[in-house]
């Protein structure tokens, strides 16, 4: 738990943090990456399997600046955006390259954040204000979740080994607020 849904100035919901990997390597300055990667596990069975471990989705890497009020991070942070439809892991790398996409005949799968990492950022402020620091929570990996047809489109059913944590509020008094996705900068980043 820990980093539960934080409301930022753009009312974006960022889900709580579960386990997360080692801190990222030093960020590359002034370089924007938009790279699709295979975010899933390698397949061991035919792709008719209902095991979510056989599915994979795209992880797009973006660098962006974190803003907080009038302040902006000294360096951009690199984060993942989970994108695209899920398909069997063995097909995805080729499918991305050839412009094809596997479409399941059964339930829809969706690519969503799986793990998060925290990163300290130094914020530079205008008007001679002293720099300030905060910790931002960034997506570290993506996973596939199945969209059940019996529920509202926004409800996702998790087949992963780690159950998705509910979109709670911040720590002691959990509650979620409305979400606005994909803003260009991580406004307040939490």
């Amino acid at each position: 738990q820990g980093w539960q849904a934080f409301k930022n100035d753009a009312t974006e919901i960022i889900p709580e943090l579960g386990e997360y990997p080692e801190p990222p390597p030093e960020l590359e300055n002034n370089k924007t990456m938009n790279r699709a990667e295979n975010g899933g596990r390698p397949p061991h069975h035919p792709f008719e399997t209902k095991d979510v471990s056989e599915y994979s989705c795209r992880e797009l890497h973006f660098t962006r600046y974190v803003t907080d009020g009038p302040c902006r991070s000294a360096k951009p942070v690199t984060e993942l955006v989970c994108s695209g439809q899920c398909g069997p892991a063995r097909l995805l790398p080729n499918a991305i390259g050839r412009g094809k996409w596997w479409r399941p005949s059964g339930p829809d799968f969706r690519c969503i954040p799986d793990r998060y990492r925290a990163q300290r950022v130094q914020l530079l402020c205008p008007g001679g204000e002293a720099p300030r620091a905060r910790k931002v929570r960034l997506v570290a990996s993506c996973k596939c979740k199945r969209l059940t047809r019996f529920h509202n489109q926004s409800e996702l059913k998790d087949f992963g080994t780690e159950a998705a944590r509910p979109q709670k509020g911040r720590k002691p008094r959990p509650r979620a607020r409305s979400a606005k996705a994909n803003q260009a900068e991580l406004e307040n980043a939490y």
């Epitope: 738990q1 820990g2 943090l17 002293a130 620091a133 910790k135 307040n188």
Partner: antibody
Framework: EVQLQQSGAELVRSGASVKLSCTAS????????MHWVKQRPEQGLEWIGW????????EYAPKFQGKATMTADTSSNTAYLQLSSLTSEDTAVYYC???????????WGQGTTVTVSS | DIQMNQSPSSLSASLGDTITITCHAT??????LSWYQQKPGNIPTLLIY???NLHTGVPSRFSGSGSGTGFTLTISSLQSEDIATYYC?????????FGGGTKLELK
């Protein structure tokens, strides 16, 4: 459930030192700045300082430099506040806080009462 | 140090009232103002950060406004659970400082 659990009340002699602990559960203290705030009986709140448990960086209010020492142990997910050369002025409730930023305090522990006797 | 002057120091109001607490900083603190609520015998909790951002789980009857040196906390339609002492805090520069508190009581 996310909690900041602080150590129990302390009754200490004037001139002595005391070390307070604040153990986090439900989150990793490395992901936050850990702050300490003092509240004297029937008085307001005073910020003591913050520590970044990830690297040990600290910032103290000038008033508490030399009086307070903040440390953190990430393996036990615990932040500590040591107060030295205690006087009656140090009798207070001490709160630990977890903050996403250095400049406000998201979550508060239940407080530790320190009573300094002469 | 930046001083935070809170007024009034105490306030009596009736359920359903709209109440306003003000906080004045002795120098410009931009948007870096937070509000905390401390119920009797309890711990402080964050209500509002960065002038007007509600901490998650805080009811929408709480709102904050202001900039520079003058800031306001407004509680519309006062509820019994809002009886508490309210503190402002500046996060503009070290050392961070709190207002003296406003004790809100029921009439």
């Amino acid at each position: 459930e996310v909690q900041l659990q602080q150590s129990g009340a302390e009754l200490v002699r004037s001139g002595a030192s005391v070390k307070l602990s604040c153990t986090a559960s439900g989150f990793n203290i490395k992901d936050y700045f850990m702050h300490w705030v003092k509240q004297r009986p029937e008085q307001g709140l005073e910020w003591i300082g913050w520590i970044d448990p990830e690297n040990g960086d600290t910032e103290y209010a000038p008033k508490f430099q030399g009086k307070a020492t903040m440390t953190a142990d990430t393996s036990s997910n615990t932040a500590y506040l040591q107060l030295s050369s205690l006087t009656s002025e140090d009798t207070a409730v001490y709160y630990c806080n977890a903050g996403q930023a250095t400049y406000y305090f998201d979550y508060w522990g239940q407080g530790t009462t320190v009573t300094v006797s002469s | 140090d930046i001083q935070m002057n809170q007024s009034p120091s105490s306030l009596s109001a009736s359920l359903g009232d709209t109440i306003t607490i003000t906080c004045h900083a002795t120098q410009n603190i931009n948007v870096w103002l937070s509000w905390y609520q401390q119920k009797p015998g309890n711990i402080p909790t964050l209500l509002i950060y960065k002038t007007s951002n509600l901490h998650t789980g805080v009811p929408s009857r709480f709102s904050g406004s202001g900039s520079g040196t003058g800031f306001t906390l407004t509680i519309s339609s006062l509820q019994s659970e809002d009886i508490a002492t309210y503190y402002c805090q500046q996060g503009q520069s070290f050392p961070y400082t709190f207002g003296g508190g406003t004790k809100l009581e029921l009439k």
